[in-house]
């Protein structure tokens, strides 16, 4: 049952004498494995014997007998899928039909494959795209219906017999669908390749020529042109004539139209291969070319630069840059249309010729204010001298010059005065628009460039102003030299360094931080009374009476300043002690008597001691000694002693008389 056998392989295989053939083949026998395989050459079915007759190239049987031909022919298949064959070498007489006789346990099949073996290697086939245009990449394909593992070949590309530089990509196919070798070459043809012969050459592994195919390239391209001009250098003077001729060196397909262009713009009514320019003017200077078109597109010739020579035109001056800042660099450029270019220039500053300046550019490395003004120039070439143009204005800007701060007040200035200063300058460009003052203060500027300082401070030492346009120029600071009364006056105790004790030598000094003018006088006062006129107040032996509030005054021609009040404290031992008696020094017995120890001391008495007429100390230590009830025996002389941190003092004796009461007298 034929439906049970399915084969896949190329229908025809091609080779040449001495090469080899590789036959990719697959099959499927559904009823079981292959038991017998015979490869016939041109098999014929014999109806009588019901068998195939023909040359047996290969036989595979159960007993494994293999004919000698099997060395050349190999079955590379298996019992159920693969039926690939190889014939190596292959001969001319192998051409014809190969028959694959397959037998399984129950089925038989004859599969036929065509083999075409030529006497010599057959040529490859070059495939070209339908149209080739210049500079457009195309792929050239060289195809050979041959590939065999045992016989390596190569395909090489030649242009006009010379190997092509471009890298080709070679691919092979040995499949049940197709057997071939292919080489693909990517190539960007130029117009010059038109009509050239391209060859694909088949070579063996050693590079020996086997066969080839050739094609002629038909490269479509725009017209290729050559332009000729008379005179050949294309340099003329105004009024001369010029002829230009356009020649087509190649065009594929043929050209259709001709035109001329100047500086890229088409010239009207110029549609022939010759362009005649009569009595040229300088405006006709420029780049000329001819343009010829075909179906591919327009082609342009190279450009011819026509130079119409003329004397310089009136010149203009360009300044880099104006306004210019003083100290910066400036460049002047003389611009004049001329052909040939000017060879000599004459420069003018404010109408006066600038000596030694003959170049197109004038460079001033450091601009100064006097460089300002009008600059003009004259250009000269072989055809003549141009005219002087209107010129250009150079504006030189600079900070205000010679700025000074001027005090408007009569001198000297005193603390508290209103001071007016002005800011003056010599010149400025651009104009001064504002002023600055140092140091900054809450000061008035009644008008531009004038500063008014109300109630000037003693410590306003210097003032500087700046006049400003785009820049500020500072004046040197001006000293106000403000005069003021002495400041920070104080009393300083020079000696002793510790507390002042009565009898000490004491020195007080009147000190202050500053005074202007420096010449000063001193005054000392105590409780509003003038004590002295020296800077120092000396006490050879201080007494408690000297204690009190002291001030010193320092004056100069501007005014006087007093110190803070300074308290002079004198420490002394208790003095002027006395015993006072209350209600009096005569007291009736039974009543109350109070003795008080009065004293003058600094610091105050801290401890009292009482004594009787026998100098016997009494057990009382307070300022008051209270006797209650007083007895006649209390009569007698008493004294007290006071003690402080400085020392002791004692009182004179004070006598207390205690007399009898009427009751006591009555009892007696």
């Amino acid at each position: 049952d034929s439906s049970k056998w399915v084969f896949e392989h190329p229908e025809t295989l091609y080779a040449w004498e001495g090469a080899c053939v590789w036959i990719p083949c697959t099959y499927r026998a559904l009823d079981g494995d292959l038991e017998s395989f015979i490869l016939f050459h041109n098999p014929e079915y014999n109806k009588n014997t019901s068998k195939f007759d023909g040359t047996r190239l290969y036989e595979s049987t159960k007993d494994g007998k293999v004919p000698s031909e099997q060395k050349r022919v190999q079955f590379l298949g298996d019992k159920n899928k693969n039926c690939t064959l190889s014939i190596h070498p292959v001969h001319l007489n192998d051409s014809g039909q190969l028959g694959l006789r397959m037998e399984s346990k129950t089925e038989k099949w004859m599969e036929r494959i065509h083999l075409n073996v030529s006497e010599r290697p057959f040529p490859p086939h070059i495939q070209l795209p339908p149209e080739i245009q210049e500079s457009q990449e195309v792929t050239l394909t060289c195809l050979l219906n041959f590939s065999c593992y045992g016989y390596p070949i190569q395909l090489q590309w030649l242009l006009e017999g010379v190997p092509m530089r471009q890298a080709a990509v070679t691919s092979t196919s040995l499949t049940i669908k197709s057997v071939f070798t292919r080489s693909e070459l990517k190539f960007s043809p130029q117009w010059s390749h038109h009509g050239k012969i391209v060859t694909c050459q088949l070579q063996d592994a050693d590079g020996k020529f086997l066969s080839n195919d050739t094609v002629q390239l038909n490269v479509k391209h725009t017209p290729k042109l050559e332009i000729k001009v008379t005179p050949s250098d294309a340099i003329v003077r105004e009024g001369d004539s010029v002829t230009m001729t356009c020649e087509v060196s190649s065009s594929n397909p043929e050209y259709t139209t001709v035109s001329w262009l100047k500086d890229g713009t088409s010239l009207k009514k110029q549609n022939t291969f010759t362009l005649n320019l009569r009595e040229v003017t300088k405006d006709q200077s420029g780049k000329y070319c001819c343009q010829v078109s075909n179906d591919v597109g327009p082609g342009r010739s190279e450009e011819v630069f026509l130079q119409v020579q003329y004397a310089p035109e009136p010149s203009t001056v360009q300044i880099l840059h104006s306004p210019a800042v003083e100290g910066s660099q400036v460049e002047f450029l003389c611009m004049s249309l001329a052909n040939p270019l000017p060879t000599n220039y004459t420069w003018y500053h404010n109408g006066k010729e600038m000596q030694g300046r003959t170049e197109e550019k004038v460079h001033i490395p450091k601009i100064l204010p006097w460089h300002a003004g009008t600059y003009s120039c004259v250009a000269e070439n072989i055809l003549g001298t141009g005219q002087r143009g209107p010129g250009a204005e150079l504006d030189v800007q600079y900070p205000p010059k010679k700025v000074t701060t001027v005090i408007q007040n009569p001198m000297p200035i005193r603390e508290g005065d209103t001071v007016t200063l002005s800011c003056n300058y010599n010149s400025s460009n651009p104009s001064v628009t504002r002023y600055e003052w140092k140091p900054h203060g809450a000061w008035e500027e009644p008008s531009l460039g004038v500063l008014k300082i109300q109630n000037v401070g003693w410590d306003n030492t210097t003032i500087a102003c700046a006049a400003c346009n785009s820049w500020c120029s500072w004046a040197s600071p001006v000293a106000l030299n403000v005069q003021y009364a002495p400041r920070d006056v104080r009393v300083r105790k020079i000696k002793p360094l510790s507390e002042i004790h009565s009898g000490n030598s004491v020195s007080l000094q009147c000190d202050f931080s500053s005074s202007h003018p420096k010449e000063v006088q001193f005054f000392w006062e105590k409780n509003g009374r003038l004590l002295g006129k020296e800077s120092q107040l000396n006490f050879d032996s201080i007494s408690p009476e000297d204690a009190g509030s002291y001030s010193c005054w320092v004056n100069n021609s501007i005014g006087q300043t007093a110190s803070k009040a300074w308290t002079l404290e004198v420490l002394y031992a208790p003095r002027r002690l006395r015993v006072s008696m209350s209600p009096g020094d005569q007291v009736m017995e039974g009543k109350s008597a109070t003795l008080t120890c009065e004293s003058d001391a600094n610091p105050p008495v801290s401890h009292y001691t009482w004594f009787d007429w026998n100098n016997q100390s009494l057990p009382y230590h307070s300022q008051k000694l209270r006797l209650e009830p007083v007895k006649v025996q209390h009569s007698g002389a008493y004294w007290c002693q006071g003690t402080n941190s400085v020392g002791k003092g004692r009182s004179p004796l004070s006598t207390l008389t205690v007399y009898y009461s009427p009751e006591t007298i009555g009892r007696r």
Epitope: I494, S513, T567, P603
Partner: antibody, heavy 119, light 112 residues
Framework: QVQLVQSGAEVKKPGASVKVSCKAS????????MHWVRQAPGQGLEWMGI????????SYAQKFQGRVTMTRDTSTSTVYMELSSLRSEDTAVYYC????????????WGQGTLVTVSG | EIVLTQSPLSLPVTPGEPASISCRSS???????????LDWYLQKPGQSPQLLIF???NRAPGVPDRFSGSGSGTDFTLNISRVEAEDVGVYYC?????????FGQGTKVEIK
């Protein structure tokens, strides 16, 4: 011995006033000027003003003008510093310091009073 | 007002080594009689400031002689000849020439 003893710590609300006292002992109270200095947390010393205990005259730093009042009571040898319209930045330790009559240096300092101002 | 500028603001020291602090005034503190009204104070951690040097170079009573003050006019220096551990704290200069009294920012001295 000579010493200045200040009143204790105070906590006040913003806008309130505080009155700190400084009691002098061991010397003649009226013979020496008294200054007030404050120190905000982690900051330096800042002078506030001076009072003459003898006559009661004062001089204040520009910054505190109108908010600070310094007074004295000679009977108790005490000076006072009152700061009004308190704000959080017034949180500081406030010191009284005696001015040495010879040199003008602050030879004796109080122990300080912490005033905290918080909402 | 007079502005006092101290430097450095922080001073790490090694015990036994010398140390110095600078104080610069915005105007001269020298008086008519030649006194420089600049004082130095030390504020130890958690304590009130204490007087070290008065009128530029005079040591206050009880201050060790390793402390000394020098300078005149606008530039003053406090020197510690050999730093001891108890000298740590913040040192301030103050001008006593005029009211308002002004202080430097303070220099923090700490042991390395």
């Amino acid at each position: 011995q000579v010493q200045l003893v200040q009143s204790g710590a105070e906590v006040k609300k913003p806008g309130a006033s505080v009155k700190v006292s400084c009691k002098a002992s061991g010397y003649t109270f009226t013979s020496y000027y008294m200054h007030w200095v404050r120190q905000a947390p982690g900051q330096g010393l800042e002078w506030m003003g001076i009072i003459n205990p003898s006559g009661g005259s004062t001089s204040y730093a520009q910054k505190f003008q109108g908010r600070v009042t310094m007074t004295r009571d000679t009977s108790t040898s005490t000076v006072y510093m009152e700061l009004s319209s308190l704000r959080s930045e017034d949180t500081a330790v406030y010191y009284c310091a005696r001015e040495d009559s010879g040199s003008g240096a602050f030879d004796i300092w109080g122990q300080g009073t912490l005033v905290t101002v918080s909402g | 007002e007079i502005v006092l500028t101290q430097s450095p603001l922080s001073l790490p020291v090694t015990p036994g080594e010398p140390a110095s602090i600078s104080c610069r005034s915005s105007r001269s503190l020298l008086s008519y009689h030649g006194y420089n009204y600049l004082d130095w104070y030390l504020q130890k951690p958690g304590q009130s400031p204490q007087l070290l040097i008065f009128v530029g170079s005079n040591r206050a009573p009880g201050v060790p002689d390793r402390f000394s003050g020098s300078g005149s006019g606008t530039d003053f220096t406090l020197n510690i000849s050999r730093v001891e551990a108890e000298d740590v704290g913040v040192y301030y200069c103050m001008q006593s020439l005029q009211t308002p009294r002004t202080f430097g920012q303070g220099t923090k001295v700490e042991i390395k």
